[in-house]
């Protein structure tokens, strides 16, 4: 059986590790190209060298391969607050991250935005800010947590969930008012 030419994984499995099956001759296994290089020409025959060329500037391959083109280097997204941690090399893509005291929020698997870590004003740090998670705050009495910020209970409306957290505070205020009238 001749493997499907479109099914790269099945074709590779016919050859030993580190080799791939010649696209025009399934009796020949060619050596894969090292990371940092790409396939320029398939090996002409068994035991003969594959013609691999180094990736050009702005492109890379991070593992052994038989790609016809190197992959384009990623660019860090300024509009998302990203900064370059390490620049692209022929065998490694750009590494993007966030500044100090910021964390990554992933909107999707391959898209993140940098946000400032919460300072927990009017509260205490329950869990410190991590690379991919904001600080977790615990609020002082008289404050409730809203979108990871400690907000005064005076901003708590009856319809909001904060009523449970602010209830003792509200009752205290009522109690003070009642005792003042006698």
């Amino acid at each position: 059986l001749v493997p499907h030419l479109g099914d790269r994984e099945k074709r590779d499995s016919v050859c030993p590790q580190g080799k791939y099956i010649h696209p025009q001759n399934n009796s020949i296994c060619c050596t894969k190209c090292h990371k940092g290089t790409y396939l320029y020409n398939d090996c002409p025959g068994p035991g003969q060298d594959t013609d691999c060329r180094e990736c050009e500037s702005g492109s890379f391959t991070a593992s052994e391969n038989h790609l016809r083109h190197c992959l384009s280097c990623s660019k860090c997204r300024k509009e998302m607050g990203q900064v370059e941690i390490s620049s692209c090399t022929v065998d490694r893509d750009t590494v993007c991250g966030c500044r100090k005291n910021q964390y990554r929020h992933y909107w999707s698997e391959n898209l993140f935005q940098c946000f400032n870590c919460s300072l927990c004003l009017n509260g205490t740090v329950h869990l410190s800010c991590q690379e991919k998670q904001n600080t977790v705050c615990t609020c002082h009495a008289g404050f409730f947590l809203r979108e990871n910020e400690c907000v005064s209970c005076s901003n708590c409306k009856k319809s909001l969930e904060c009523t449970k957290l602010c209830l003792p505070q509200i009752e205290n205020v009522k109690g003070t008012e009642d005792s003042g009238t006698t």
């Epitope: 509009e79 998302m80 935005q113 946000f115 979108e147 990871n148």
Partner: nanobody, 119 residues
Amino acid sequence: EVQLLESGGGLVQPGGSLRLSCAASGFTFAHEPMVWIRQAPGKGLEWVSHIDRVGQDTYYADSVKGRFTISRDNSKNTLYLQMNSLRAEDTAVYYCAILPKRGPRFDYWGQGTLVTVSS
């Protein structure tokens, strides 16, 4: 008051095209990166595409790459999404939004426009 008003949705056959618009007011449009997000029936919000302030840098979700094009006209305070080669799985309510700055939540987004892809 910030206002974002989407339009251009409708019923379209698979393989068809639509162009969504988002008219912005109440803020300096040219100063804000903008986002298109969508919500398919019974699903969560999905980031579709975004564009920087000047329209130079763009991003597309893998599911729409090569089919959708985001653009903006700062002189008209309008954001666009050109949708080609539409598929049934593109059926959703599409929202435009200002890229969040303070935290991972959308403080400003529109009421949405429904796109239905069906034969």
